[in-house]
Interface confidence: low
């Protein structure tokens, strides 16, 4: 009968960490010699394994080879690793007297693709915070999958995001494969609460994708409004200043109070208002002593917002000198903000 | 109603480089939600995007250019300008500024500028 | 760079003619795809963005339509204003990209 060497996958597909068989049967037992399993093509191909008995980590034959009618030279390889994806032929010698064995005919091959699942999508965005309207650059990085074939998308809030650019890298064949995808986004005021989401689909997740998030809250700043309004006096030589610091993020917040420029009392907010928004409210009250003041006093609110310029309210309280009656105080506020750049 | 208007010199000199300003009107460049883009069109050809900014700064160039090209933005003058170095005669066009919406195309182009690059 | 490919690169039609402009992606571009009207030494002007939307103020006799890698362009009833080269362009990808362009003759 004529030898033929029969290898009946043209290629399997195993997920990293399990087992998978190559199978490989013969036609004939003659003429005599070894089948030995080899990776590859050429002179660099990579013996795998020879029925030789001796041990291999990881490789077993799958029937009996010591049977002097076995044709199955079929193996058995655990533990797939990504390292082990390639083409597997199992390839037929005769023996040789004195010389080394002869290569007589060799399977067709099999491709082993290893699916190794992608790492979970790390999603990163810039250094710095962005304020409303800008838009902003957020990259999503998994790695280590295969095969190449993999579906990524970015959401925002639940609205599918077109990206920039997707690569996966390298292009050529690998054992494993990244992907790296970067979305543009334009910040709003609301995004306090608001994420970005890249979702990784593959064939090695069972349709259930992985998720990287991004919560837009630690890209964004939103700068206060800053308001200083007069409360009704609480007696007849008291005046209520009232500074609203509004709908600010980051919580970081210093407010100053000034009296004609002169630093009067420093306000650390402790208990800050959240609105639904994500954002915060402060509101700090500043009592004006009356009869301390004969002239006209300048109280300036001084907000500095997460490191940036200090925004500045000023209100004018006209002195006890200019009024009719000795137990009020008039003021005047001034809506001109003016921005202090030191 | 936003209009743009391109502005530079129409001759330049090989080896030297392009400068050229477009200046926003009807509307503010740092009123966001818009990119400010640089287009050209080589004579008899079709049109090449060389890059866009927005008014806080990102910035994108076409990878073909990109080693030679400048985008930067003026938002106090409500300018954006494009220069380009070591230009050839390959780089004889006429250039337009648009904005682009974030999805919704080049809405509003300048009229355009014919710029020769000639000794 | 994603390629667009667009045909015819001209052709001649009679008014009240009903005219069609395809265009090819060399990738998937969803529907990220806007069509620009140009004229003899004027600025091209916007059409269609995102593939199917009008933009404002242009006749509803331009429409626009298609996703992913094919798309289409239409003039229902061709009129003498309508002569000029048309483009399409994707924003899916960096850099944009214009395809070769169609103009656009009156028989």
């Known amino acids: 009968k004529e030898l033929k060497v029969t290898q009946p996958e043209k290629s399997v597909s195993v997920a990293a960490g399990d087992s998978t068989v190559l199978n490989c049967t013969l036609t004939s037992l003659l003429p005599v010699g070894p089948i030995r399993w080899y990776r590859g093509v050429g002179p660099s191909r990579l013996l795998i394994y020879s029925f030789a008995g001796e041990y291999v980590p990881r490789i077993r034959n799958v029937s009996d080879t010591t049977k002097r009618n076995n044709m199955d030279f079929s193996i058995r390889i655990s533990n797939v690793t990504p390292a082990d994806a390639g083409i597997y032929y199992c390839v037929k010698f005769q023996k040789g007297s004195s010389e080394p064995d002869t290569e007589i005919q060799s399977g067709g091959g099999t491709e082993v693709y290893v699916l190794a699942k992608p790492s979970p999508p790390e999603v990163s965005g810039p250094a710095d915070r962005g304020i409303p309207d800008q838009k902003v650059n957020f990259t999503c990085k998994s790695h280590g999958f295969s095969p190449r074939n993999i579906t990524l998308k970015w959401f925002k809030d639940g609205q599918e995001l077109h990206p920039l650019e997707t690569t996966v890298n390298p292009s050529g064949k690998n054992v494993s494969y990244n992907i790296s995808s970067t979305v543009r986004v334009v910040l709003n005021s609301m995004d306090v609460n608001s994420k970005v989401i890249c979702e990784v689909a593959h064939i090695t997740l069972d349709r259930s994708p992985l998720r990287g998030i991004a919560n837009l809250s630690n890209f964004i700043r939103v700068s206060p409004t800053v308001k200083v309004t007069q409360q009704s006096p609480t007696s007849m030589n008291q005046v209520n200043l009232t500074c609203r610091a509004e709908r600010f993020y980051p919580e970081d917040l210093q407010l100053i109070w000034l009296e004609n420029g002169n630093v009067s009392r420093n306000d650390t907010p402790k208990n800050l208002t959240k609105n639904t928004d994500g954002t915060y409210n402060y509101t700090s009250l500043f009592l004006v002593n009356s009869s301390a003041h004969r002239e006209d006093v300048v109280f300036t609110c001084q907000v500095k917002h997460d490191q940036q310029p200090a925004i500045t309210r000023n209100h004018t309280v006209l002195g006890f000198a200019h009024s009719s009656d000795q137990g009020s105080m008039q003021t005047f506020p001034d809506n001109n903000a003016t921005h202090n750049w030191n | 109603q936003v209009q743009l208007q391109e502005s530079g010199p129409g001759l330049v000199k090989p080896s030297q480089t392009l400068s050229l300003t477009c200046t926003v009107s009807?509307?503010?460049?740092?009123?966001?939600?818009?990119?400010w883009s640089w287009i050209r069109q080589h004579p008899g050809k079709g049109l090449e995007w060389i890059g866009a900014?927005?008014?806080?700064?990102?910035?994108y160039y076409n990878p073909s250019l990109k080693s030679r090209v400048t985008i930067s933005v003026d938002t106090s003058k409500n300018q954006f300008s494009l220069k380009l170095s070591s230009v050839t005669a390959a780089d004889t066009a006429v250039y337009y500024c648009a904005r682009e919406g974030y999805h919704s195309g080049m809405d509003v182009w300048g009229q355009g500028t014919t710029v020769t690059v000639s000794s | 760079d994603i390629q667009m490919t667009q045909s015819p690169s001209s052709l001649s039609a009679s008014v009240g003619d009903r005219v069609t402009i395809t265009c090819q992606a060399s990738q998937d571009i969803s529907n990220y795809l806007n069509w620009y009207q140009q004229k003899p030494g004027k600025a091209p002007k916007l059409l269609i963005y995102d593939a199917s939307n009008l933009a404002t103020g242009v006749p509803s006799r331009f429409s626009g339509s298609g996703s992913g890698t094919d798309f289409t362009f239409t003039i229902s009833s061709l009129q003498p204003e309508d002569i000029a080269t048309y483009y399409c362009?994707?924003?899916?990808?960096?850099?944009?990209?214009f395809g070769g362009g169609t103009k656009v003759e009156i028989k």
């Open positions: 009807g509307g503010s460049i740092s009123s966001g939600g818009y990119y």
């Open positions: 900014i927005y008014y806080s700064g990102p910035i």
């Open positions: 362009q994707q924003f899916a990808y960096l850099p944009w990209t």
